[in-house]
């Protein structure tokens, strides 16, 4: 495997693009069991209907790979565990990509992104000890291809879930 993006290995802030700029996805630093900061993106607007919060990564080179794999580690709150939000709370988010030769796209319209999949929390999860808390970490992998441009952007669309993206890794498999 060749890694193209690993959010856990980025030094400092990830600085991905959130839309809207305020009130949607927020970058939040948490400490792992070794007291090392993990950069996460979180959103939990479960009280208000019709949420449409987007988060876009930086440009990711494909390094000639025809097909890439996206591994997302995330936590997703069960709506039943959040008091009194059943009508508006959701338990999925959407994953998109946009191919581009331009590594500095300033603005990408929502309708330019191609949907990869709707992601839900699996029944299986990894329990991760962080201090005195247990984090239930889901892992989902999706692939996309064939790719033709020099690189691409990923986007995550929140529609009203309580979610934290803990790790995003993009890789391809060497022949």
């Amino acid at each position: 495997e060749v890694t193209l993006l690993d959010s856990r290995s980025v030094q400092g802030e990830l600085g991905w693009i959130a839309s809207p700029l305020e009130g949607g996805w927020e970058e939040v630093s948490i400490m792992d069991e070794k007291n090392t900061p993990i950069r996460t993106y979180q959103v939990c607007n479960v009280m208000e209907p019709s949420q449409n919060n987007w988060l876009r990564t930086d440009w990711i080179t494909r390094e000639g790979a025809q097909r890439v794999y996206i591994e997302i580690k995330f936590t997703l709150r069960d709506c039943n565990s959040l008091p009194g939000v059943m009508g508006t709370c959701k338990e999925t988010f959407n994953l998109y990509y946009y191919e581009s030769d331009n590594d500095k796209e300033r603005f990408i319209r929502e309708n330019q992104f191609v949907k990869i999949d709707t992601i839900a929390a699996d029944e299986s999860f990894t329990q991760v000890d962080i201090g005195d808390r247990i984090m239930k970490l889901n892992t989902e992998i999706r692939d996309v291809g064939p790719l033709s441009k020099k690189g691409f952007y990923l986007a995550f669309q929140d529609v009203g879930a309580c979610i934290a993206l803990v790790s995003v890794r993009v890789f391809y498999k060497k022949a």
């Epitope: 305020e22 927020e26 939040v28 979180q42 997703l76 565990s81 962080i130 984090m135 934290a164």
Partner: nanobody
Framework: QVQLQESGGGLVQAGGSLRLSCAAS????????IGWFRQAPGTKREMIAA???????NYANPVKGRFTISRDDAKNMVYLQMNNLKPEDSAVYYC????????????WGPGTQVTVSS
Amino acid sequence: QVQLQESGGGLVQAGGSLRLSCAASGFASDAYAIGWFRQAPGTKREMIAAVTKAGATNYANPVKGRFTISRDDAKNMVYLQMNNLKPEDSAVYYCNAISPLWDEYDFWGPGTQVTVSS
């Protein structure tokens, strides 16, 4: 050790105002948001307002436009300004952390009683 102490409740006439305060300490710095919740007799607890670390706010429909949540991180305080109160706002009000990371509420403060008379 998480400590939550709500205050500011009381008896008020319909159309009146109250300002609730929550002294919150012991939360990890990764608490994404602080929220206000309420529970009326015979009903389930409901989340009514939240303010994130970055200061973004959101509200449940029954209180939108009437209640305002704010936070003062320097003082570890969260506030709920309640205007144009209605009898159906009568409940015990609680504050707590809201986090996508943790799936349990293992500690609640005593709450503060709000009673709105008609």
